[in-house]
């Protein structure tokens, strides 16, 4: 069978080889398509309800005024010339429709390096057969499930026209220190060969590099956190980040009801002040970051100063914030 590719909505003429150029003709066309069950026979004398879909022209050719999805299938003509010689023509018809130019919707203007980000959703409407969508980074194809690339695809079919809508959502994890303005595009490749791909306009999101968080340092004075009863302990929270974050204090994992401050002074230490202290720095961009915990303990006169005392009472005693 001869393969014929026809665009949906366009006319199509199939020649009946060996047919006399004008009536009288001995020929018949047989169709096996989405409109038929088994074979439908059309003859030159026909003329009827099928004319809107396919009719035999005076020269014996079969004329389809506007090809549709249901016209995909086999078309056969059997003709006899004036000398009684029989000729058969056999066609396999496939139809296609090129969609509109694909578009990237819901596109991100900024991506964060090191974490997965949704880049956007590529949409193609009105294709047949369905075809495929693919993503490109700086002109090179992106391979799903490689190097932090993932793609979620969806295909829908219009209930009346039978044409396809494709959607493809791209997620990427940009590498730290990579291109600060990558160029993403999406292209539609038709399901039938010999038709070029359609590409979207590119998008160029910025890649934001989160500054690596330097540790929050907690400095204790006296060193080791062991102090005689009635002594003073000074805790200083050192955060390299700019602008300076807000500092809150914790004792035994519970926030202390104090205004934010980078320094915590514990004057006239008593048993109730013993415990594990830490500070929490809250950055507007990164969220909270906690320091290591230090133990504050009381040493009775004559004891060696331990580097870490045991956790004592729950009272707050007298606190001073510098």
């Amino acid at each position: 069978a001869q393969n014929i590719t026809a665009r949906i909505g366009e006319p199509l003429v199939l020649k009946c080889k060996g047919a006399p150029k004008k009536p009288p003709q001995r020929l018949e066309w047989k169709l096996n398509t989405g409109r038929t069950e088994a074979w439908k026979v059309l003859s030159p004398q026909g003329g009827g309800p099928w004319d809107s879909v396919a009719r035999v022209l005076p020269n014996g050719s079969l004329f389809l005024p506007a090809v549709g999805i249901q016209d995909e299938g086999i078309f056969r003509c059997q003709a006899m010339n004036r000398n009684g010689k029989e000729t058969k023509s056999n066609y396999r018809v496939r139809v296609y429709q090129i969609p509109g130019k694909p578009e990237i919707v819901d596109s991100a203007s900024e991506l964060t390096a090191g974490v997965p980000n949704k880049v956007g959703t590529c949409v193609s409407e009105g294709s047949y057969p369905a075809g495929t969508l693919s993503w490109h980074l700086d002109g090179k194809p992106l391979v799903p499930n490689e190097k932090g690339v993932s793609v979620k695809e969806q295909t829908r079919r219009h209930p009346e026209t039978g044409l396809f809508t494709l959607q493809s959502e791209l997620m990427v994890t940009p590498a730290r220190g990579g291109d600060p303005r990558p160029t993403f595009s999406c292209s539609f490749s038709p399901g039938l060969p010999r038709h070029r791909a359609l590409r979207t306009a590119p998008i160029q999101p910025r890649v934001w590099e989160p500054v690596p968080l330097e540790e929050v340092q907690l400095v204790v004075e006296p060193e080791g956190g062991a102090v005689a009863p009635g002594g003073t302990v000074t805790l200083t929270c050192e955060v390299p980040a700019q602008p300076s974050p807000q500092i809150h204090w914790m004792k035994d994992g519970v926030p202390l009801p104090l205004p934010p401050s980078p320094v915590l002074i514990l004057p006239e230490i008593g048993p109730q002040d013993q415990g594990t202290y830490s500070c929490v720095a809250t950055h507007s961009s990164h969220g909270p970051q906690e320091s290591r915990a230090v133990s504050i303990s009381i040493i009775e006169p004559g004891e060696e100063g331990p580097t870490a005392g045991s956790v004592g009472g729950s009272g707050l005693g007298t606190l001073a914030l510098a």
Partner: antibody
Framework: EVQLVESGGGLVQPGGSLRLSCAAS????????MTWVRQAPGKGLEWVAS????????YYPDSVKDRFTISRDNAKNSLYLQMNSLRAEDTAVYYC????????????WGQGTLVTESS | DIQMTQSPSSLSASVGDGVTITCQAS??????VNWFQQKPGKAPRRLIY???NLADGVPSRFSGSRSGTDFTLTISSLQPEDFATYYC?????????FGGGTKVEIK
């Protein structure tokens, strides 16, 4: 909403002529074939004529061929049936219907107009 | 020409009954059959298109089926408004041919 409204029916002498009209609205008229169907009093439905969407091709049963002519004016969204040499057996309610080809069949119908041959 | 032989020509039934009407085509007409309902003094209304498809706005108690050249209209549970005359139509070839009609009456 698809609407088909027939007019032009009435009493006619044997051998006389009558022209029926059908005004269409609520759809793209020139996308559809159109058809006339009739129903004699107390009887079933009978196909009378069909015309393709462009108006280039017309179709009739033997019972009315050469006497009736179907036509259309796509600019006016109108369908017509010119009936000549009327006979007693042409007495019927005449319906205008959308379609007549394999893509549509007959989907929407007008309310009909009565043609009576006075013999 | 194609003949569409419709049966029965009339039937009596009660509200709630199931009803089956058949049309037999004299030759293959594919799926190209419609079913219509007509009430006295009114235009026909399409119920089923292409043998098995329910037209818009038609209650789901109506259904169409096909086996070769035999076509069936089924009303699963008759309602008072279903008492009417029903016609089949083949539109695969000219002349377009209607069945003779089936009058569904109240028992």
């Amino acid at each position: 909403e698809v609407q088909l409204v027939e007019s032009g029916g009435g009493l006619v002498q044997p051998g006389g002529s009558l022209r029926l009209s059908c005004a269409a609205s609520g759809f793209t008229f020139n996308n559809y074939w159109m058809t006339w169907v009739r129903q004699a009093p107390g009887k079933g439905l009978e196909w009378v004529a069909s015309i393709d969407n462009s108006g280039d091709n017309t179709y009739y049963p033997d019972s009315v061929k050469d006497r009736f002519t179907i036509s259309r004016d796509n600019a006016k969204n109108s369908l017509y049936l010119q009936m000549n040499s009327l006979r007693a057996e042409d007495t019927a309610v005449y319906y205008c219907a959308r379609g007549g080809d394999i893509t549509t069949g007959l989907d929407y119908w007008g309310q009909g107009t009565l043609v009576t041959e006075s013999s | 020409d194609i003949q569409m032989t419709q049966s029965p020509s009339s039937l009596s039934a009660s509200v709630g009954d199931g009803v089956t009407i058949t049309c037999q085509a004299s030759q293959d007409v594919g799926i190209y059959v419609n079913w219509f309902q007509q009430k006295p003094g009114k235009a026909p209304r399409r119920l089923i298109y292409r043998a098995t498809n329910l037209a818009d706005g038609v209650p789901s108690r109506f259904s169409g089926s096909r086996s070769g050249t035999d076509f069936t209209l089924t009303i699963s549970s008759l309602q008072p408004e279903d008492f009417a005359t029903y016609y089949c139509l083949e539109f695969d070839e000219h002349p377009l041919t209607f069945g003779g009609g089936t009058k569904v009456e109240i028992k």
